[in-house]
Structures are given as C-alpha cells and as structure tokens.
C-alpha cells in the first residue's frame, strides 16, 4: 500500500541497505524511491539530543515483508518509498537549504552574484550534483559570494554540517531546467575509451543508455552487444565519465555501441521505463518468487505489482502442461539490473513497469497514427483540448495542449476580451465538437496566466497557461505532450503536425471533427523573407508549404504544432498568427515553445 506521510520520532529497526546524507526527510524519501531496493527509510534530523555526526543521515532500508518494527527515537523521521504509490514521481528538488554545508568533491569555485546564479551554474554544469554558496553575510569576507560546485559518486552529499550564512541546494537538471545539449544518438561500432565508474548487465544499448541517464556519475556509456567477440563481456554496459564531460577517445569496434546520458532531456524521453520484451533471453538474479502465468505480458504485470520485483524471466508452457500457463520468475538484484544475461534458452525477459511513473507521462507511446486523410481519429492527439467560452453563448474559442495534470498551454491572443476564467471550459478527449452536450464533463479554469510581455500575436510572447480547477486523470484519450528540451534547440524536426477544429479556408466555420495536417518547418530566415513587414524573432517558429494549401486557420489558435522526435511527441509550437490561411509563400507563425520552457516551468512549478 502507498503510505506518503512521514512518521515523526520513529525509527525503523533493521533492514539497512546503505546510509546517505540528505538535507531533509522529504528528500530522503525521494532518494529511497529512486534506489533500486529501498522500501523504507529512517532520517535523523538535527537535534540537541542527537550526536551531530548523525544529523542528516538517511538510512535506506529493505524488508521482505515491506515493513519493519518501529521504535521511538527523538529526532528520527521514518517513512516509506513512493515505489508503492501509483502517482507521478519526480526527483526535482528546488529547495534551498539555509545554514547547511552539503559536502562533496568541490571541483569548481567561483564568485556568483546570488544563490540562484550559483544554482543555475550547477544546473548547466555537466558534473554538478549540488552546490554551496556563501552569502553576503558570511563571516569570512573573502569567501562571501563564493559558489562551490560539487559532485559525489552517489549524487548525494558525503556529509552535511551546519554552517551559518551559507546556503546549499541541488542541480535542477532533473527539473528540465538545464541548457546542456541533449545528445540522443547512439553510435554503432564505437567504444568510448574513458574511465568506467560502474558496469551493469543490459539487454540492449537503449536500456544501457537509460541506466546511464539515472546513474549520478555517468556521462556516457559503451555497450557490448550479444555478438561481441569476448564472451565474458557480452551484454555489458560500461558507465563512463571524463573530466571534460566528453569522451576523450572513440575507438572503432564492431558489435559495440556507445552513447550519452540523456540527463538534460530526461523529462521528454523515458529513462526509467524499460517496457520492451527480450525474446530467447534469460535474466539472472536473486529469485523473489515463481508464479504461473498465461503469457509474458501477464508475467510483467505480476512483476510490476510485486513491489520488490525488478525484472523477470518467463518460460512458456510446454504443450498442454499446467493449463497452458508458463512459469514466471520474479527477480531482483542489488542494482536493479540482471546479474547475468543468457541467450538461447527460450525464456522471455523484461523489467517491472513500476518505474515508469518516474518518467514524465508525456513520454508514453500513444497508439499508431492513421496515415493520410485530414480528419483525426479518437486518441490520435490526446493532448489536444478544445477551449470553450460560455459568454455570450457557448462556442469553441481556441485549441490548447495538456502539458501537466493541471495545466493547459495555449495562446495569449485567445483571451482578448475574456474578463474572467469563470466563463471558460476546457474539454479533453474530444474528437467531434458535436459530442459536447450540456452534461459533458469539462475542466473549469482557476487561473489564466498570460506572458507579461505579450501585447499582440504578431509581436511575440503569444503564450498563456490555464491552471485547471481539478486535475486531469490521464487515459489513452487525454494525456500530456512533452515540452521540447532546452538542450534540443538544434534538433531539426521533420515530422510535424498542426491540429485543430479551426476553419478549413479563410471564410468558413469551425469544423466538427478534429483536423490534422502535416506541415514542414520553415527556417526563420525564410519566414522573415515572407513577412517583410514583421519581425520574425527567435521566439517564433514558422511552418508551411511554399505552395500553400495546408495551414492552421481561425479557431486553431492556441493549439499545438506537434513534432515527433525519437518516438516521443513534443510541443514545438503554439498556433499564433499568419497572413490569411494556407496562402502561397505565407507560412503559419507559431510561438516557439522551447524559448519559453523556463517561463512555463517557473509558472507551473511555483509553490
């Protein structure tokens, strides 16, 4: 069961896996959740009754029964990992810890104007896990405003001590706030010859890359495939680092693959969720249980539902044995990866899907698209919403996109003349406008947040957020779209679609069925030539065919320009403005979402 509350003055007895240092019990719970085996923890807060060397210790624990005996102890705070919970989990920690020195390996010392600047520096430095900043009130004059960037093997401090007039905090890479490049390519026949910080077994290079991404010290990796000549190294995933942050040497070697940590794009790409099945593959590890199961899918479900299960191997039933049920071996290991991978034994293996909730919901694969045609089908664009106004009568006003369970991203120009959020209704999971009746459920709008630099669509900043009154429960027909990574600014998107219920030509009416059109992106230089009377800024993005014919139009405003990249859909643009609709040499102009990621995160993650 999911227990989220913390138990004050309580200590769990036994079951220790390891001890780390965390600045708070809340963060200890997050560390426990991300640890492959931790189910419970005990944190020691600072207290006069406690030995200062034990302050801020976070003891990670495991138990076969999923619980441990409780003992009363002043200053101890205990709790359970969120592994047992179904809600979305994030490692993002924006808290600033006052008067705490989080110790680690200081590898960079420089002057910064503020703690925020120091944190930004940490976020944009490939090695940085956390920082300590000496404030203007720090007793040592010479050390005031010094920003120390730190890292450790575990990503958590090696010790935490009290220190007046300093503040500490963590890198915001896991909050999607890093400007570091996001390199998704996997390089075949390549070995990166740098120092290994760890090695695990993985079934393929993609899993290896995902493991590298959530390993605190891994910056890039090399994976030896099952055809690798040296048998003892087959399926070996080497996690690597270097001082520069980049591989120093690339060696051409057949049957090896290499790539980079996806740390700076992890909010828009799955990094915890290994959903594939590996046929004719056996995963070895500590056996948790052996259960009968009808299929490998059923076996994966059993593993996902068993909180301690990390991976499984399913052996299909022999002919008519056991009512056609095979054996499902539920397994675990110290690091969450198989201890050995064997091929050719007929097993089907895979991983728990329990960790999928640590990934952004927007990375979930949606059902295959219908190729051709202009009318969409149900569930094809599950992030698309229709925004209605009820004044003076109810009608479709604009499109919008679900980007979080309480947030819709749309265009600012939609709210011209809208006096209050009370007159707005957001409908999700809608294909046809005719589905919307008096009793159709909708989301009320709690708040309209318009970019404070917005004046008119043509001059930019045409972006707005709607905070919903209630949260969206994600289903196949209503789920979020990923925001583009700031590290993806140089990605060239080739599979982009504009969707909406808007006009199909300039003098027309709102369409009943959600329309879609595949549209190529146009460079800003090209776009500027087509709009000589306007300034096409880097905060705008253009799309359209030279000959015209396909475009967004009236009523599509605020809706998404969705681009698929590496199997994940990204909200690249917001339909904003254009000259006419689908006119020759007049591309549509969209708000360039990547340039507003900081603004979006600032508004949506505000406490």
């Amino acid at each position: 069961e999911c227990v989220t509350q913390l138990l004050k003055d309580t200590c769990f007895e036994g079951g220790d896996i390891t001890t780390v240092f965390t600045p708070s019990a809340k963060y200890c719970q997050v560390v426990c959740t991300y640890h492959p085996r931790c189910l419970l923890f005990t944190f020691t807060a600072e207290s006069p009754s406690e030995d200062p060397t034990r302050w801020f210790t976070c003891v990670l624990k495991d138990s076969v029964t999923e619980t441990l005996p409780r003992v009363n102890r002043t200053a101890a705070i205990s709790g359970y990992s969120f592994k047992q919970c179904s809600h979305q989990i994030s490692a993002c920690n924006k808290d600033i810890y006052v008067d705490l020195d989080m110790k680690g390996i200081n590898y960079n010392s420089s002057v910064a104007k503020s703690a925020q600047e120091c944190q930004e520096r940490c976020t944009d430095d490939v090695h940085c896990h956390f920082f300590t900043y000496a404030t203007r009130q720090f007793p040592s004059l010479e050390h005031r405003n010094i920003c120390l960037l730190k890292h450790t093997q575990t990503g958590t401090p090696t010790r935490i001590t009290k220190l007046d007039k300093v503040v500490s905090g963590f890198s915001l890479k896991s909050c999607a706030l890093s400007n570091l490049a996001c390199i998704r390519d996997i390089f075949p026949n390549t070995v990166f010859a740098d120092s290994n910080i760890d090695s695990v077994m993985a079934p393929d290079a993609f899993v290896c890359g995902r493991i590298c991404t959530h390993h605190p010290g891994c910056l890039f990796f090399t994976f030896f495939s099952q055809e690798w000549p040296k048998e003892s190294q087959r399926n070996l995933c080497l996690l690597k680092t270097s001082e520069s942050g980049l591989p120093s040497t690339r060696i051409k070697k057949s049957k090896a693959l290499s790539g980079f940590s996806l740390q700076s794009c992890r909010h828009s790409i799955p990094v915890f969720c290994h959903s594939s099945f590996y046929h004719d593959t056996d995963f070895l590890g500590e056996e948790l249980d052996i259960v009968a199961a009808k299929s490998h899918e059923a076996c994966q479900k059993l593993c996902t539902n068993a909180v301690r299960c990390q991976f499984f191997t399913y052996t299909p039933a022999q002919a008519s044995c056991n009512e056609g049920k095979g054996k499902c071996y539920l397994k675990l290991s110290s690091n969450g990866s198989p201890t050995k991978i064997l091929h050719g034994r007929g097993g089907i293996s895979g991983y728990t899907l329990r960790l999928c909730k640590m990934d952004n919901e927007c990375t979930t694969k949606i059902k295959p698209r219908i190729v051709g045609g202009t009318a969409s089908v149900r569930g094809e664009w599950p992030w698309q919403v229709t925004l209605h106004t009820t004044s003076p009568t109810q009608r479709h006003l604009c499109g919008g996109s679900i980007i979080g369970n309480q947030w819709i991203l749309t265009a600012a120009h939609c709210f011209y003349g809208v006096e209050s959020p009370k007159i707005l209704r957001v409908y999700s999971g809608i294909l046809n406008q005719s589905e919307i009746k008096e009793d159709t459920s909708f989301f009320g709008v709690q708040e309209i947040i318009i970019h404070d630099q917005y004046k008119m669509a043509e001059s930019g900043y045409d972006i707005a957020l709607l905070k919903l009154e209630t949260t969206v429960n994600y289903t196949d027909s209503q789920r979020p779209i990923c925001l583009p990574s700031k590290g993806d600014r140089n990605v060239i998107y080739t599979d982009c679609w504009v969707t909406g219920w808007g006009y199909r030509k300039l003098r027309d009416k709102i369409q009943n069925t959600l329309q879609k059109a595949k549209i190529p992106l146009v460079t800003n230089e090209e776009c500027q030539k087509r709009y000589r009377g306007h300034k096409i800024t880097h905060k705008m993005i253009c799309a359209g065919y030279r000959e015209g014919g396909k475009d967004a139009c009236k009523g599509d405003s605020g809706g998404p320009l969705s681009c698929k990249h590496n199997e994940v859909w990204h909200l690249v643009g917001i339909t904003s403005w254009g000259e006419g609709c689908a006119q020759r040499e007049r591309p549509g102009v969209y708000t360039n979402v990547v340039e507003y990621v900081d603004w979006i995160l600032e508004k949506t993650q505000a406490v």
């Epitope: 390996i105 200081n106 590898y107 960079n108 010392s109 420089s110 002057v111 000496a134 720090f138 007793p139 040592s140 004059l141 010479e142 050390h143 120390l148 960037l149 730190k150 220190l163 007046d164």
Partner: antibody
Framework: QVQLQESGPGLVKPSETLSITCTVS????????IYWVRQPPGKGLEWLGM???????DYNSALKSRVTISKDNSKSQVSLKLSSVTAADTARYYC??????????WGQGTTVTVSS | DIQMTQSPSSLSASVGDRVTITCKAS??????VAWYQQKPGKAPKLLIY???YRNTGVPDRFSGSGSGTDFTFTISSLQPEDIAVYYC?????????FGGGTKVEIK
C-alpha cells in the same frame, strides 16, 4: 583520501629563489584554495599567501614583493616561489587546503635552510 | 593588516582541568576565527573554524566562542594527549594571520 605533499630543495643559498611544490590528491585544485604557511625553528606560524580555486592570489603584505604562488590544475600541483632569500627565511614550509578561510588539511611540511 | 594577540603564551594545568586561551584581534573579524593544535614535529591540525564549529572528528571537550575582536578557546577537561601548542587564526580578511601560540603543558 585527501593528501598534500610538499617537496623542496632542502638547502638554498642566500639571495637565490626558493621553489617548493605542493602536490595534492583526493580533490581538485579548481574547487579549493591552497595556502602556504611557514614556521621558523622554535617559532609560531606565519601565513605566506594563497591561491584560490579560480586562480586568484593573495599574499602576506610584508612578503608581497618576493612571493609568487601559481598552480597547474591538470598536474594537481601548486608552487611557491620566494625570491632573494636570507637566513630569516629558514623554516618549515607547509601547504594547506582552504575550508572557508580555515585550513582543514595540511601537508607534513618541508624544511628549507638558507645558508651559503 | 589584522594582528592577532594570543594569551597566555604558555600555561600549565592538571589532567581534568578546564583550560581557556584568549585571542584578541586588532580590528573586527566578525566570527571568522579558527583554532589549531600542533604537536611537536607535526603539522598543525584544525580544531575549530568560524569561532565555534568543531572540525570532523574533534572531541567535544574542545570549544570556541566570541565575536568581533575577542575570542576564547576552551578545553573543558584537559587530557594527557592535549599537550601541544594552540594557535588562533583570523580568516576574515586576507592576509590571514595567526596568533603567537599558547603552549599547554601538564602539571
């Protein structure tokens, strides 16, 4: 683990330049300041100067014209040069790591005698 | 430059006694004062930094207090292994400077 090790010439002639190197391990010079401190035989500690993580330097006012501290981050080495030495510069020379102005780790020191 | 005047220059006390050493700065140094212990033939060892923070592994019989210009270092119960020279140091403003030292002996 954190270690600092001084290495010096042992004996230096008057008016020459004294050069000592401090080689560190277990931490990076880009993240920590390094101090030089000396102790004449039977006397107290004297602060000579420091080099910060970002390369800035600070020196003892009385020795400023004669002291130079530099470093090579890639080699994890900090060097102290003291020019125009006299017998008064005979001392044990220590390098130490900065922790907010205090010195949390010290080398074992190297003895330098100035004599002709 | 800031001068640190340490007193006494030497003291003799019995095992278990409370020992106090003082340090006076020539100008305000906030709370940026450290205390070191040096045993014969060894490098100094950091005991206290920023007036009152004990370094890792330092026994709690060692403590420090003060602010501005007047600082005190205390050994609450002198032990035989505490025989050493103790130095204060201001780390408020460069050039940093040490006190002249206090030699602690057992009676």
């Amino acid at each position: 683990q954190v270690q600092l090790q001084e290495s010096g010439p042992g004996l230096v002639k008057p008016s020459e330049t004294l050069s000592i190197t401090c080689t560190v391990s277990g931490f990076s010079l880009t993240g920590y300041g390094i101090y030089w401190v000396r102790q004449p035989p039977g006397k107290g500690l004297e602060w000579l100067g420091m080099i910060w993580g970002d390369g800035r330097t600070d020196y003892n006012s009385a020795l400023k014209s004669r002291v130079t501290i530099s470093k090579d981050n890639s080699k994890s080495q900090v060097s102290l040069k003291l020019s125009s030495v006299t017998a008064a510069d005979t001392a044990r020379y220590y390098c130490a790591r900065d922790y907010y102005g205090s010195k949390d780790y010290w080398g074992q020191g190297t003895t330098v005698t100035v004599s002709s | 430059d800031i001068q640190m005047t340490q007193s006494p220059s030497s003291l003799s006390a019995s095992v278990g006694d409370r020992v106090t050493i003082t340090c006076k700065a020539s100008q305000d140094v906030s709370t940026a004062v450290a205390w070191y212990q040096q045993k014969p033939g060894k490098a100094p060892k950091l005991l206290i930094y920023l007036t009152s923070y004990r370094n890792t592994g330092v026994p709690d019989r060692f403590s420090g207090s003060g602010s501005g210009t007047d600082f005190t270092f205390t050994i609450s119960s002198l032990q035989p292994e505490d025989i050493a020279v103790y130095y204060c140091q201001q780390h408020y403003k460069t050039p940093y400077s040490f006190g002249g030292g206090t030699k602690v002996e057992i009676k």
